[in-house]
Interface confidence: low
């Protein structure tokens, strides 16, 4: 269904004559008759199979025709059709002189014809006007035409019916070709399927209206991408529903057993280092100057032997005091009152006098240090070994003894603890800074997933239609997570098919 539209623009009849050559009196009061029919190689008289239309008198002799011209006529002229547009046509436009007001064919003299044009050809459906100009000996007609589809009809031939809708049967408008264009938030062949909230998990979430995200059993969160852990799980997480994978430092089926007392309770005082040594037990390594189980007791400051060169330490209320041996002075007896005459430099050190011989300085050979070159150089004082490696002096050089999991000259390289596949029963291994951690599959626990914790209720594959099975550890039963289109405790029932459509 569509409309052939003809827009008359300008008619020129400068001499104001009829087709016979006879002049109009007083001028040619011009109206038009239009005949639209099927394609004919030679346009001949006969029925106007696609329709006819006439105009009122539009002007005299030569005139321009305005859009929606006055006098009751319409410009463009409309020739509606109720069939598939064939793509070809024949068009006859006759210009007639109306001596009076009666424009009926039988009321006009036979020689009232001013001009007649006939064209035929191909014409595709479209919004663009085709411009044309037809000239005869005495007249010229300028016009344009096009074919457009009626409301709700689309496609190259106006044969596709499409009505926009926004209800249970679909949510769409129609594209120029008649295909459906879904309204925002809808998808699917008939735009019946809502588009869920952006990011809503494809398998674990669903929606019944746009921008919604409803979670399937075992899942939670705005986007249904957070699993629900085992009921009663205290300090654990899950990667699939009903799991309870313990956080670091926690153990047991419900991750409620504290394996990391140090982190959770910080029992060591005064900057001491805490080490876990079993469930709810720990050891504090105190900093110098402190003692006690939790390093809560302050030691005498003299216990750290602050006085050098054989000086003796005495406690004071707010610190300590060094008593220096003969030839030394200073807060820690670090300065000498000897001179080079006393040969104070040991281990081959050379003596240099200072302050006119009042004191001296020793220049030490390699591998010796101290104000009197009395100390052998300890190459480990700078603590060059990384990752807790132990530094060992070996003659003129040094070496690092590395902790398990580290290698390299300075223990700077991390050896993957996971390389030897330590996790049993398909557990997933994670390298940590201080070792490794196993994430166990459902039904297993322990540091290496070596402990079977429950019967695997999913082992018998009880779920139908490719549903995902999860074991509920608290009851040793299973839960089936159904794919889209299926319901039931085992996903055995298909959801009813969508109703058929009325077009």
């Amino acid at each position: 269904s569509g409309v052939f539209q003809l827009q008359l623009q300008e008619f020129i009849n400068e001499r104001g004559v009829l087709a016979s050559g006879r002049p109009c009196e007083p001028g040619c009061r011009t109206f038009f008759r239009v005949c639209l029919k099927h394609f004919q190689a030679v346009v001949s008289p006969g029925p106007c199979t696609f329709g006819t239309v006439s105009t009122p008198v539009l002007g005299t002799n030569s005139f321009a025709v305005r859009d929606d011209s006055s006098g009751g006529g319409r410009n463009p002229l409309q020739l509606p059709f109720n069939f598939t547009w064939p793509g070809t046509f024949s068009l006859i436009i006759e210009a007639w002189h109306a001596p009076g007001d009666d424009l009926r064919p039988e009321a006009l003299p036979p020689d009232a014809l001013i001009s007649k044009i006939a064209i035929q050809g191909s014409l595709a459906v479209g919004q663009n006007w085709l411009l044309d100009e037809q000239t005869s000996t005495l007249t010229r007609l300028r016009y344009s035409y096009r074919v457009i589809c009626s409301d709700n009809y689309y496609g190259d031939n106006c044969s596709r019916l499409c009505k926009k809708r926004n209800d249970h049967f679909g949510h769409y408008v129609c594209q120029p070709d008649g295909n459906l264009s879904c309204l925002p938030g809808w998808t699917g062949e008939y735009c019946q399927q809502p588009i869920c909230l952006s990011g809503c998990h494809e398998q674990n979430g669903y929606c019944s209206k746009p921008a919604e995200c409803l979670c399937r059993p075992g899942w939670q969160g705005r986007l249904c991408n957070e699993c629900i852990p085992h009921n009663g799980c205290r300090h654990g997480t899950c990667s699939t529903p009903w799991q309870c994978t313990c956080d670091e430092g926690w153990g047991g089926l419900f991750c409620d057993q504290d394996l990391n007392y140090c982190t959770h309770h910080s029992p060591c005082k005064n900057g001491a280092t805490c080490s876990n040594s079993g469930q709810r037990s720990y050891t504090c390594t105190c900093r110098p100057g402190y003692t006690g189980v939790d390093c809560e007791l302050e030691l005498s400051e003299c216990d750290s032997n602050p006085c050098r060169n054989g000086g003796s330490c005495k406690d004071q209320e707010d610190g300590y005091h060094c008593l220096c041996p003969p030839g030394y002075y200073g807060l820690h007896c670090e300065h000498s009152t000897l001179s080079c005459a006393d040969s104070p430099c040991f281990n081959g050190g050379s003596c240099r006098e200072r302050n006119q011989g009042a004191n001296y300085a020793c220049e030490c050979p390699p591998n010796f240090t101290g104000s009197n070159c009395e100390k052998k150089v300890d190459r480990c004082t700078s603590n060059p070994c990384a990752n807790g490696g132990q530094c060992l002096n070996r003659g003129p050089s040094r070496m690092c003894r590395c902790r398990p999991g580290f290698t390299g000259t300075y223990c700077e390289l991390h050896v993957s603890d996971c390389a030897r596949n330590p996790c049993a029963h398909g557990g997933t291994c994670h390298d940590l800074e201080n070792g490794l951690m196993c994430t166990c599959p459902a039904g297993f626990s322990g540091r290496r997933c070596e402990v079977r914790t429950s019967i695997d209720a999913c082992a018998s594959s009880p779920c139908f239609n490719r549903a995902t099975c999860y074991t509920d550890l608290s009851t040793d039963t299973f839960v089936c997570n159904c794919p889209y289109g299926f319901v039931g405790s085992r996903c055995e029932f298909p959801v009813g098919l969508p109703p058929s459509f009325p077009w």
């Epitope: 623009q9 321009a64 663009n128 006007w129 085709l130 411009l131 044309d132 100009e133 344009s144």
Partner: antibody, heavy 122, light 108 residues
Framework: QVQLVQSGAEVKKPGASVKVSCKAS????????MHWVRQAPGQGLEWMGI????????SYAQKFQGRVTMTRDTSTSTVYMELSSLRSEDTAVYYC???????????????WGQGTLVTVSS | EIVLTQSPATLSLSPGERATLSCRAS??????LAWYQQKPGQAPRLLIY???NRATGIPARFSGSGSGTDFTLTISSLEPEDFAVYYC??????????FGQGTKVEIK
């Protein structure tokens, strides 16, 4: 938006020909007639002719009949105006102008090219 | 062909004054007449079509009147940017489309 972009200035000798182009964009090229209008230095506007880009049909002012040729290339949405047997009085700015066919201002010129100066000098 | 005659050839006015330009046709053009403004180095700009209709984006100070053979373009209060050459053009009888010879509005 509608744009008409013309070719650059030309200097020609008497007796030669010149071909000026006008590239259209921003609308359906074949739906609007195109006109050429020229303006000699310090003078008024002079209509030269019209071309129907849809079929290529033309109509020229009597004054230029036989000397002017208007053509179009629908693949590039471009119209051309060629003027031959140039004389010094053809020195002018040549404009293409789109007829406002699909609006109420039919057969007036709402959109113009920027103009092309053609100088005819020996 | 229809000849359009514009008067005066030059109009010397000050900003804020009212400008009245005339265009006379050698025969009736009904109301099929337009007015254009042209500034040096620029293409003409359509101001008024069909004798009295303002084109898109044209300020209200520009108005057109007349029918048949006598037409007037009025600029109610001249702005500095209105000093230019103004042409009338008919589309009643064509070809050719014809223009008037122009009226120059200059600053007094």
């Amino acid at each position: 938006q509608v744009q008409l972009v013309q070719s650059g200035a030309e200097v020609k000798k008497p007796g030669a020909s010149v071909k000026v182009s006008c590239k259209a964009s921003g609308y359906t090229f074949t739906s609007y007639y195109m006109h050429w209008v020229r303006q000699a230095p310090g003078q008024g506007l002079e209509w030269m002719g019209i071309i129907n880009p849809s079929g290529g049909s033309t109509s020229y002012a009597q004054k230029f009949q036989g000397r002017v040729t208007m053509t179009r290339d629908t693949s590039t949405s471009t119209v051309y105006m060629e003027l031959s047997s140039l004389r010094s009085e053809d020195t002018a700015v040549y404009y293409c102008a789109r007829e406002e066919y699909a609006s109420s201002s039919a057969e007036y010129f709402q959109h113009w090219g920027q103009g092309t100066l053609v100088t005819v000098s020996s | 062909e229809i000849v359009l005659t514009q008067s005066p050839a030059t109009l010397s006015l000050s900003p804020g004054e009212r400008a009245t330009l005339s265009c006379r046709a050698s025969q009736s053009v009904s109301s099929y007449l337009a007015w254009y403004q042209q500034k040096p180095g620029q293409a003409p700009r359509l101001l008024i079509y069909d004798a009295s209709n303002r084109a898109t984006g044209i300020p209200a100070r520009f108005s057109g009147s007349g029918s048949g053979t006598d037409f007037t373009l009025t600029i109610s209060s001249l702005e500095p940017e209105d000093f230019a050459v103004y042409y009338c053009q008919q589309r009643s009888n064509w070809p050719p489309w014809t223009f008037g010879q122009g009226t120059k509005v200059e600053i007094k």
